[in-house]
C-alpha cells in the first residue's frame, strides 16, 4: 500500500468560450481508495478555489459553468490525489479559455447538385454554425473545412471554405455517390468533430470541369 501516483491534467476544452471542462488522468492508486480534488486560482489572485462541478464532465473532470468562466484570464489549476498513505499533486496547468475552444460540429448540412443551363454543373454545399456559438457578438470567427469522397474511395478531398457557410465544388465524378462532411474551428482553438455525413448521388450526365 502506497501513496497515490501523480495525476495529470491532460485536456481542457470549451464549446463556446462561456463554459469549459478539464479532465485528468489518475496516477496509480497505491492499492487504496483515492480521492481527487481540483483546485485553481486565477492569474493575479492568490485565493484558491475548489472545482465547482465534478459531475457534468464525467469521471475525473471539472466543469466550469458560466459564472466561473472568464475570457483572457489565465486559470492555474492542479489536481490533488489523496489516500490513507499520503498525497500527490499534478503539475500546475496554465489555461486561457480563449485558446481551448472546440466547437460542436456545424449543423444542417445540405448538399445539392445544381445544373444551370448556361454554366458548368456544380455541387452546392450549405450548413449552419453550431448552436452554442453566438457569431453576432463578434467574439468569434469560425472557419470551415469540407471533406468529400466517393462512397467506396479511401481518400478524402479537402476544401477550406474560410468563414463562408456555403461552398461550390465543380470537379466530381459522374454517376458516383458521394459522402460530404463539414467541420469548424474558431480563430484560436481546435477543429470540431466532422458533422454526420450527408450522401449525394451525382447524376451520370454531370459534366466534369475542364
Amino acid at each position: 500500500q502506497l501513496p497515490p501516483g501523480k495525476p495529470e491534467i491532460f485536456k481542457c476544452r470549451s464549446p463556446n468560450k462561456e463554459t469549459f471542462t478539464c479532465w485528468w488522468r489518475p496516477g496509480t492508486d497505491g492499492g487504496l481508495p483515492t480521492n481527487y480534488s481540483l483546485t485553481y486560482h486565477r492569474e493575479g489572485e492568490t485565493l484558491m478555489h475548489e472545482c465547482p462541478d465534478y459531475i457534468t464532465g464525467g469521471p475525473n473532470s471539472c466543469h466550469f459553468g458560466k459564472q466561473y468562466t472568464s475570457m483572457w484570464r489565465t486559470y492555474i489549476m492542479m489536481v490533488n490525489a489523496t489516500n490513507q498513505m499520503g498525497s500527490s499533486f499534478s503539475d500546475e496547468l496554465y489555461v486561457d479559455v480563449t485558446y481551448i475552444v472546440q466547437p460542436d460540429p456545424p449543423l444542417e448540412l445540405a448538399v445539392e447538385v445544381k445544373q444551370p443551363e448556361d454554366r458548368k454543373p456544380y455541387l452546392w454545399i450549405k450548413w449552419s454554425p453550431p448552436t452554442l456559438i453566438d457569431l453576432k457578438t463578434g467574439w468569434f470567427t469560425l472557419l470551415y473545412e469540407i471533406r468529400l469522397k466517393p462512397e467506396k474511395a479511401a481518400e478524402w478531398e479537402i476544401h477550406f471554405a474560410g468563414q463562408q457557410t456555403e461552398f461550390k465544388i465543380l470537379s466530381l465524378h459522374p454517376g458516383q455517390k458521394y459522402l460530404v462532411q463539414v467541420r469548424c474551428k474558431p480563430d484560436h482553438g481546435y477543429w470540431s468533430a466532422w458533422s454526420p455525413a450527408t450522401f449525394i448521388q451525382i447524376p451520370s450526365d454531370f459534366t466534369m470541369n475542364d
Partner: antibody, heavy 122, light 112 residues
Framework: EVKLVESGGGLVQPGGSLKLSCAAS????????MFWVRQTPEKSLEWVAY????????YYPDTVKGRFTISRDNAKNTLYLQMSRLKSEDTAMYYC???????????????WGQGTSVTVSS | DVLMTQTPLSLPVSLGDQASISCRSS???????????LEWYLQKPGQSPKLLIY???NRFSGVPDRFSGSGSGTDFTLKISRVEAEDLGVYYC?????????FGSGTKLEIK
Amino acid sequence: EVKLVESGGGLVQPGGSLKLSCAASGFTFSDYYMFWVRQTPEKSLEWVAYISNGGGSTYYPDTVKGRFTISRDNAKNTLYLQMSRLKSEDTAMYYCSRQLFYYGSRGAMGYWGQGTSVTVSS
Amino acid sequence: DVLMTQTPLSLPVSLGDQASISCRSSQSIVHSNGNTYLEWYLQKPGQSPKLLIYKVSNRFSGVPDRFSGSGSGTDFTLKISRVEAEDLGVYYCFQGSHVPFTFGSGTKLEIK
C-alpha cells in the same frame, strides 16, 4: 515532471548544417507551443524560432529566416531545429523551451532544457 | 524589432537589501488582445534561464513572493524585496507581444 533534453550540437564548419533535437516528456507534447532560444558566448539571449502545437505555424527572426527550420513530431514527442548555411555568429548554446500556457500562441517560456552547444568554426 | 533596454547592467547589493531592475521597450508591448507579454527570467551560473514573472506581474509557480513585477506600456520593473544568496545571477526581461520576440541584454545581480 516536465523534462526537455536537447541533443545534436557539435562543431561544424561555416556553410555546414546541423540538426538539433529536443526530447520532451512529462506533459502532453501536442498541446503546447515550443521554442528554440540561443545564448551567445557573450551571454546574450536570442529567440530563434517557435512552432505551434500542431506544427502548422512557425516563426523566425530575420537573423535565421531561410536558414533554420523548426519542426516537431508529436508522435515521438520531439522538437527539431534544422540549421543550414551556418555562420560563425550562430555559435551559441541552443535551448528548447515549452510555453507555459496550455495551447494558445502567446505566453512565457515556463520550462527549459539544459541546452546543446553549437560551434561554427573552420 | 522591439528593443528591450535593461538598466543597470550590473547591480551590486548586500544580502537582505532591496534590488530593482528596470526594463524599457522601444515601443509599447501591449498586444492587440490587451495583454502585455513582458516576462522576467533568472539565469544562475551554469544553469538554463528560469521563468520568474509573466505578463508583467504574475509570479510563476514556486517563485518566492519577494519577487514582484510592475509597469505598463514601455516601462517595467522587477523588484526583489530582500535579496538572498540564491537570487544571484543574471536577470533578463523579454517581450512576447510582437514578433520577433526579444530579450533585454541582462542585469547581473552580485554581492557588494
